[in-house]
């Protein structure tokens, strides 16, 4: 259950999907990937204030305990709730092949 | 694919399962839960250095981009990989009921 989508820290400051442009070199993939040469990486970035997009009961517990013991228990963290698949053309021992990766690009985000 | 379980920061410093004792009051549950009166909350706490317990390709990408752009891209975060169910005896309008929660206690951890 997503608990709230209103960000009390101001627009764009809380957990949400961001796009970061990255080259094969940036990703350390130049030695095994041929295409694409550049990836629009979607990832989850931002703060997780109290009950914002809480993924589940565990996230709600974490919020409560972080409020009580901030030095011991970290705040919930902004991570992917689901992924978009992506295809890579990769080098193999014998040549190239097209491979689909299901866990590469974040599709949407929540706090956990 | 878990990439590595060796913590380069020293024993116990990296992402792993911790137990935090919490009362119903700590959790904000006193008004709707009768038992247990205290919960041994298992949660995932610790750093996620390069490729440590990387949950998937996305986590590996995040590590690479964090190294390049630490102010833009956060390091991967230590979160539950799976959960242990837990039963709560909760108050209802008509009395009490026994309810199982599948997403309350972390079972093991990874970095994402």
């Amino acid at each position: 259950a997503r608990n709230g989508d209103h960000c009390p820290l101001g627009p764009g400051r809380c957990c949400r999907l961001h796009t970061v442009r990255a080259s094969l070199e940036d990703l350390g993939w130049a030695d095994w990937v041929l295409s694409p040469r550049e990836v629009q990486v979607t990832m989850c970035i931002g703060a997780c204030p109290s009950q914002f997009r809480a993924a589940n009961m565990h996230a709600q517990i974490k919020t409560s305990l972080h409020r009580l013991k901030p030095d011991t228990v970290p705040a919930p963290c902004c991570v992917p709730a689901s992924y978009n698949p992506m295809v890579l053309i990769q080098k193999t021992d014998t040549g190239v092949s097209l491979q689909t990766y299901d866990d590469l690009l974040a599709k949407d985000c929540h706090c956990i | 694919a878990r990439n590595g379980d060796h913590c380069p920061l020293g024993p116990g410093r990296c992402c792993r399962l911790h137990t935090v004792r919490a009362s119903l009051e700590d959790l904000g549950w006193a008004d709707w839960v009768l038992s247990p009166r205290e919960v041994q909350v298992t949660m995932c706490i610790g750093a996620c250095p390069s490729q440590f317990r990387a949950a998937n390709m996305h986590a590996q990408i995040k590590t690479s981009l964090h190294r390049l752009k630490p102010d833009t891209v956060p390091a991967p975060c230590c979160v539950p990989a799976s959960y242990n169910p837990m039963v709560l005896i909760q108050k209802t309008d008509t009395g009490v009921s026994l309810q199982t929660y599948d997403d309350l206690l972390a079972k093991d951890c990874h970095c994402i």
């Epitope: 295409s35 698949p85 992506m86 295809v87 890579l88 053309i89 190239v96 097209l98 590469l104 | -």
Partner: antibody, heavy 118, light 107 residues
Amino acid sequence: QVTLKESGPGILQPSQTLSLTCSFSGFSLSTSGMGVSWIRQPSGKGLEWLAHIYWDDDKRYNPSLKSRLTISKDTSSNRVFLKITSVDTADTATYYCARTGWDFFDYWGQGTTLTVSS
Amino acid sequence: DIVMTQSQKFMSTSVGDRVSVTCKASQNVGTNVAWYQQKPGQSPKGLIYSASYRYSGVPDRFTGSGSGTDFTLTINNVQSEDLAEYFCQQYNSYPYTFGGGTKLEIK
């Protein structure tokens, strides 16, 4: 496994509109990087690339035919469509659809033949 | 548009020989070139991607080379099943363009 199959009318008269369908299985056009291209080949001649549609609905056309071409997709039913308006005898050819990952044409359909004749 | 020229329309070779099919681009296309094989009555099949990388499952007697404007497909130890037409293609820029094809005949 990946398969693509083209279907079309077989015969058209000049000035009519050609509607082609590429039905595919074994992959999804919602996958980032995936696309489908249409290519044609007049009998005994070379290959001519016509149009391409990407997973994100970005479309590319051969400029020499752009005003006559429309490519579209139905991701949920795994189909890609191509329309060519005002066909002429010069459009007589075998029409192929091919799967692409980025720019990698790795699977082709068997082709569908069009004859334009009055 | 980038023009891909395969100057030899036909090439004749014998089983066991080595043959080289050439392709010239009208402008620099880097290594963004693919090669396709089309057997009689069949649809094209990918052989080489990015000028020199074999498609998965392609026998290693097929090799690609070149960059910029000049590209070569070499078939070592030609087999009878290699009787086909070979097309180069550039994907450096739209529109994608193909060479006119080179038909390989087996003596």
